[in-house]
């Protein structure tokens, strides 16, 4: 058993069937010695008397709230929730494995530039009781700061028959120097609890492999006199890490109709402009990626041909 | 421990051909070596991250854009003393600070060819004949040292004379490549920046 | 699977116009970019074009304009490539090679070759 | 245009050997550069497209690399099938062109 915050504490519990479960000494926070009675949640029913109480700890039933109360007094409350270990593998019921781009990726996280700042986000399928707490560090022997703001429902879906829920968080890096060379990776810890259920869900990356552009902007066009083709400008993101030339970008071009089957012409330059054939009901798309360190390409810029 | 903006003329930088070349150079090798090596920890979540020139060149800081010396997070107190007569100088505008920068870059490519060469040295020996360095690689890094020519001590080359560990080689053959990788990354944003100052 | 087939060899002579067909299959004729490319015997390939089945758009290589003209029929699935002004150095053999993507050749015709003598 | 130069011209190799094949650009072509493959009599074949992609159906030992101006076609081990002359084509601008070729002969 482990302190989660003040008054909540996690039972971390071996689940089979049969299995012995834990056992919970708990203690009134109380100087007071005699007369104490021993609750469960909203249940009048007296489970001991005592200063401490002894409980066996064995499945959801005997986890939640623990109240001691004096005279109809009450002195303090005790939370437990459960962590479930089945076959050595701690549970991971509460968020829904995005298997990319591995399997088991829960946590999933990116971040626009190299300033240290990056956001993670989860799924889940669970609407309600559910709670998140998250951390971060540099390193985890010797942690250097990251700072993480509270986790928010980012979006919801529908898939199938199913609502997906969609958290995300924002984390910055206390002390980023963007052309630092990373040799220590960023941890992410959260905490998911799910009424009684306790599970701790991490990843850790470096922010070079995390990096995905916001997609260029101000893309214009410009046909060529006497030809087909046409010049397409954009600029620089303005989330992207700056002097430009020295985290540069490079970028792909594409022109293609509505449906992905469709043909397209395709160039590839890492210059702020390139000359691609205009077909009409097409569309010219430009998404950016690092030049020198591929990480993922930037969603696409769009404009139609026309 | 900045590069100011007064940095050679358009188009009188040679090393920046140089620098794209070593960089597509280390991450063909890291690429073979991660493909040949699948059964050893060689990616980058399974290695340890060893920057062998840590305290020993201070190319980050010493290269570090104008912009970017204002951030309190990129000013480092490391400070190092180099000799100052490249030739990717190509100008007489070019300033002091560039030149320790480009020094550093002469140390860092001097230190990681005598590890590469000594490791080669030993791969040689091994018997299942698994894995060599890409002969284009070392000269790549060659081709750079010769264009930011400097004049420096030679490192000699490590020789040891117990039975080399194998396993133990390829691992750090794993750990050298990733870590000069992020380095020739570094190189290759240096000259781009110089290039277009 | 997709496939080009082109027509038979043709001797022609200078001054003249020859005229090089290639049957698609395999495929929605107008989901793909047409090229023609030619090679001389002993000697490396030169592209001369495309055009886009779908409305008949053209880009000539500048070697060519005025001296190629690129057609398609979409009722049988045939493209066309005529050369006029014929010289002996367009002796060659004249591949049409088509792809999704404008800038490069998925599959290849399997060649035609003109020979300009007199 | 785009001056696209091959070397070597000709290059000659034992089965089994790795052959490494260049190519080079007049200006900066970015990765917009494809490799194939023609023996004698046949129309060429798409090896690689766009510097590194590899195709389904071509045997992984072919491999392409390089960006800007410098690219290279490994084939890291050679059979006797691929004996034969290799075409880079750049497609960063019109008109498209190709290198000179770099013929493989066996050693």
């Known amino acids: 058993i482990w302190e989660l915050k003040k008054d909540v504490y996690v039972v971390e519990l071996d689940w089979y069937p049969d299995a012995p479960g834990e056992m919970v000494v708990l203690t009134c926070d109380t100087p007071e010695e005699d007369g104490i009675t021993w609750t469960l949640d909203q249940s009048s029913e007296v489970l001991g008397s005592g200063k401490t109480l002894t409980i066996q700890v064995k499945e959801f039933g005997d986890a939640g709230q623990y109240t001691c109360h004096k005279g109809g007094e009450v002195l303090s409350h005790s939370l437990l929730l459960l962590h479930k270990k089945e076959d050595g593998i701690w549970s991971t019921d509460i968020l829904k494995d995005q298997k990319e781009p591995k399997n088991k990726t829960f946590l999933r996280c990116e971040a626009k530039n190299y300033s240290g700042r990056f956001t993670c986000w989860w799924l889940t399928t669970i609407s309600t009781d559910l709670t998140f707490s998250v951390k971060s560090s540099r390193g985890s022997s010797d942690p250097q700061g990251v700072t993480c703001g509270a986790a928010t429902l980012s979006a919801e879906r529908v898939r199938g028959d199913n609502k997906e829920y969609e958290y995300s968080v924002e984390c910055q890096e206390d002390s980023a120097c963007p052309a630092a060379e990373e040799s220590l990776p960023i941890e992410v810890m959260v905490d998911a609890v799910h009424k009684l259920k306790y599970e701790n869900y991490t990843s850790s990356f470096f922010i070079r492999d995390i990096i995905k552009p916001d997609p260029p902007k101000n893309l214009q066009l410009k046909p060529l006199k006497n030809s087909r083709q046409v010049e397409v400008s954009w600029e620089y993101p303005d989330t992207w890490s700056t002097p430009h030339s020295y985290f540069s970008l490079t970028f792909c071009v594409q022109v293609q109709g509505k449906s992905k089957r469709e043909k397209k012409d395709r160039v590839f330059t890492d210059k702020t402009s390139a000359t691609v054939i205009c077909r009409k009901n097409a569309s010219i798309s430009v998404r950016a990626q690092d030049r020198y360190y591929s990480s993922s390409w930037s969603e696409w810029a769009s404009v139609p041909c026309s | 421990r900045n590069l100011p903006v007064a940095t050679p003329d358009p188009g009188m930088f040679p090393c920046l051909h140089h620098s794209q070349n070593l960089l597509r150079a280390v991450s063909n090798m890291l690429q073979k070596a991660r493909q040949t090596l699948e059964f050893y920890p060689c990616t980058s979540e399974e290695i340890d991250h060893e920057d062998i020139t840590k305290d020993k060149t201070s190319t980050v800081e010493a290269c570090l854009p104008l912009e970017l010396t204002k951030n309190e997070s990129c000013l480092n107190s490391r400070e190092t003393s180099f000799i100052t007569n490249g030739s990717c100088l190509a100008s007489r505008k070019t300033s002091f600070m560039m030149a320790l920068c480009l020094s550093s870059i002469y140390e860092d490519l001097k230190m990681y060819q005598v590890e590469f060469k000594t490791m080669n040295a030993k791969l040689l020996m091994d018997p299942k004949r698994q894995i060599f360095l890409d002969q284009n690689m070392l000269a790549v890094i060659d081709e750079l040292m010769q264009a930011l020519n400097f004049n420096s001590e030679t490192v000699p080359q490590k020789s040891s004379l117990e039975e080399p560990d194998f396993y133990k080689t390829k691992i750090k053959l794993c750990i050298l490549l990733h870590a000069f990788r992020i380095r020739a990354v570094t190189i290759d944003r240096v000259m781009s920046y110089l290039n277009a100052s | 699977q997709v496939q080009l087939v082109q027509s038979g060899a043709e001797v022609k002579k200078p001054g003249a116009s020859v005229k090089v067909s290639c049957k698609a299959s395999?495929?929605?004729?107008?989901?793909?970019?047409l090229h023609w490319v030619r090679q001389a015997p002993g000697q490396g390939l030169e592209w001369m074009g495309w055009?886009?089945?779908?409305?008949?758009?053209?880009e000539y290589a500048p070697k060519f304009q005025g001296r190629v003209t690129m057609t398609t029929d979409t009722s049988t699935s045939t493209a066309y490539m005529e050369l006029r002004s014929l010289r002996s150095d367009d002796t060659a053999v004249y591949y049409c090679?088509?792809?999704?993507?404008?800038?490069?050749?998925?599959?290849w015709g399997q060649g035609t070759m003109v020979t300009v003598s007199s | 245009e785009i001056v696209m130069t091959q070397s070597p011209a000709t290059l000659s190799v034992s089965p089994g050997e790795r052959a490494t094949l260049s190519c080079r650009a007049s200006?900066?072509?970015?990765?917009?550069l494809h490799w194939y493959q023609q023996k004698p009599g046949q129309a060429p074949r798409l090896l690689i497209y766009?510097?590194?992609q590899s195709i389904s159906g071509i045997p992984a030992r072919f491999s392409g690399s390089g960006s800007g101006t410098e690219f290279t076609l490994t084939i890291s081990s050679l059979q006797s099938e691929d004996f034969a002359v290799y075409y880079c084509?750049?497609?960063?601008?019109?008109?498209?062109?190709f290198g000179g070729g770099t013929k493989v002969e066996i050693k």
């Open positions: 090679a088509a792809n999704k993507e404008l800038r490069y050749f998925d599959v």
């Open positions: 395999g495929y929605t004729f107008t989901d793909y970019y």
């Open positions: 055009i886009d089945p779908e409305n008949g758009d053209t």
């Open positions: 200006q900066s072509i970015s990765i917009n």
């Open positions: 766009f510097a590194s």
């Open positions: 084509q750049q497609s960063n601008s019109f008109p498209l062109t």
